[in-house]
């Protein structure tokens, strides 16, 4: 069944920690359907963003930081590993340096740590995609 | 209650028409959340389209024509009538030379037509939106 | 080990620019994602910040220094160069250039050796 | 004027735990970098990411954060630790922002 969107859920991450997301575009790549994935230090949607990562499917996938409401140098990719019309498994792991993005199994993007990933306190998943998971994985201690 | 999104209708407009949607941002400004509004040829989504009215609210709005599956010179408005968090109405109407869009019943935004308004057979409206009215109104003959 | 080389002039004239360069050894400016810095301490003082310049060759500056600030790159010599225009006694200083792999906010883990510059006429 | 401030002087006993701290950064949105400076050398970096420490420093020197507090801890100091030290965060990632320093001293 689908989950609403957008989905926001409470988050607690640090190394270790791996957020999985699976979907799928509610439009074809021709019209540029978008999906973003925004890691927030509140509950509130207007907070700042750690990690905000979003995809304008079939084009290209943009990476920044929103900073006391400002936003950062954003870091552009072409990599596109989306498949047009196509079911996607997105997981994003916290390594000690960096975040890690998989699709589909294959990493894919990386984006440096501006900030501590234990910030965090919540992870929205939004634009147009329909949802069918999320999970957030802690390591165990 | 609220409308399936993405949204799309059959359609036939000619000068006179007006198309009215009612509908809220799912997202405050800051974050940046778009609406848009595409007259296509063809009922299917991948078709050309007479008419692109792409709100990235807060920021700016985009219109263009999508020809052969190219786009085509974008047009671009800061004009900014949408308010932050609140509901609002928009009607797009047909005049004999171009489109006349109005927000919350002012005149914001005018597109020359580039293709005839006959040619329209659909018109979808998404992305980051909820959606409460969508109707189609034809003109006496 | 990568190594890095400040040179440039000791004595600079004031309202004149400084312009210092910094040569790369055992690593390039251009890998991913190494941030690429000038950091100044005046004679008894403590480190200032002034600006970078990052893997890519987008620029950061210190906002009480940016108007005066300019931080570029000579790829194929793997340089970056400072300079600072209109400079007065008060930026008499060692320059050191240094490496953040991670992000201007986060550590430097090398530096050169600095060079000291003395703004007298 | 910095936006993090360290005390000017601290001074510990052989042998003994010295702290030295920085206050007024945001340290639980940016990491803390420590840096340890002797005269006519250029500064080493002894502690990054609050707590973690570059090889080839010694298991004495430690760092913590909490709020707007880091704190770099040099259990069983030595003579040769006597030096100028420095601690680095961000006001915003696109920046560097450097406390004034603090001179260590071994009585």
């Known amino acids: 069944s689908l989950l609403p969107v957008p989905y926001t859920e409470a988050a607690s991450l640090s190394t270790g920690s791996t957020v999985t997301i699976k979907g799928r575009p509610l439009a074809c790549f021709l019209n540029e359907p978008y999906l973003q994935v925004d890691f927030h230090t509140e509950m509130k949607e207007e907070s700042d963003i750690v990690f905000h990562f979003q995809v304008c499917f079939g084009r290209r996938v943009v990476m920044n930081s929103r900073e006391y409401g400002a936003w950062k140098q954003q870091v552009e990719s072409k990599n596109m590993p989306f498949q047009d019309g196509q079911e996607f498994e997105l997981s994003i792991s916290v390594l000690p340096d960096k975040y890690q993005v998989m699709v589909n199994g294959q990493s894919s993007y990386t984006f440096d740590h501006r900030i501590k990933p234990e910030a965090v306190k919540m992870v929205q998943v939004w634009r147009d995609i329909s949802l069918t998971k999320f999970n957030v994985s802690y390591l165990k201690r | 209650s609220l409308l399936p999104v993405p949204y799309t209708e059959a359609a036939s407009l000619s000068t006179g028409s007006t198309v009215t949607i009612k509908g809220r941002p799912l997202a405050c400004f800051l974050n940046e959340p778009y609406l848009q509004v595409d007259f296509h040829t063809e009922m299917k989504e991948e078709s050309d389209i007479v008419f692109h009215f792409q709100v990235c609210f807060g920021r700016r709005v985009v219109m263009n024509s999508r020809e052969y599956g190219a786009w085509k010179q974008q047009v671009e408005s800061k004009n900014m009538p949408f308010q932050d968090g609140q509901e609002f109405e928009l009607s797009i109407s047909v005049l004999p030379d171009k489109y006349q869009v109005m927000v919350n019943g002012q005149s914001s935004y005018t597109f020359d037509h580039r293709i005839k308004p006959e040619a329209v057979k659909m018109v979808q409206v998404w992305r980051d939106i909820s959606l409460t009215k969508f109707n189609v109104s034809y003109l006496k003959r | 080990q990568v190594q890095l080389q400040e040179s440039g002039p000791g004595l600079v004239k004031p309202s004149q620019t400084l312009s210092l360069t910094c040569t790369v050894s055992?690593?390039?400016?251009?890998?991913?994602?190494?941030?690429w810095s000038w950091i100044r301490q005046p004679p008894g003082k403590g480190l200032e910040w002034m600006g970078a310049?990052?893997?890519?060759?987008?620029?950061y500056y210190s906002p009480s220094l940016k108007s005066r600030t300019s931080i570029s790159r000579d790829t194929s010599k793997n340089q970056f160069t400072l300079q600072l225009s209109s400079v007065t006694p008060e930026d008499t200083a060692v320059y050191y250039c240094?490496?953040?792999?991670?992000?201007?906010?986060?550590?430097?883990?090398?530096w050169g050796q600095g060079t000291q510059v003395t703004v007298s006429s | 004027h910095s936006a993090v401030t360290q005390p000017s002087a601290v001074s510990v006993s052989l042998g003994q735990t010295a702290r030295i701290t920085c206050q007024g950064g945001?340290?639980?949105?940016?990491?803390a970098s420590w840096y340890q400076q002797k005269p006519g050398q250029a500064p080493v970096l002894v502690i990054y990411?609050?707590?973690e420490r570059p090889s080839g420093i010694p298991e004495r020197f430690s760092g913590s954060s909490s709020g707007d507090t880091a704190t770099l801890s040099i259990s069983g100091a030595q003579a040769e630790d006597e030096a100028d030290y420095f601690c680095?965060?961000?006001?915003?990632?696109?920046?560097?922002?450097f406390g004034g320093g603090t001179h260590l001293t071994v009585l």
């Open positions: 240094a490496r953040a792999p991670y992000g201007i906010s986060r550590e430097y883990d090398y």
């Open positions: 680095q965060s961000g006001r915003s990632s696109d920046n560097a922002v």
């Open positions: 990411k609050d707590s």
């Open positions: 945001k340290f639980g949105r940016y990491y």
């Open positions: 310049i990052a893997y890519s060759g987008s620029t």
């Open positions: 055992g690593g390039s400016i251009t890998t991913n994602y190494y941030y």
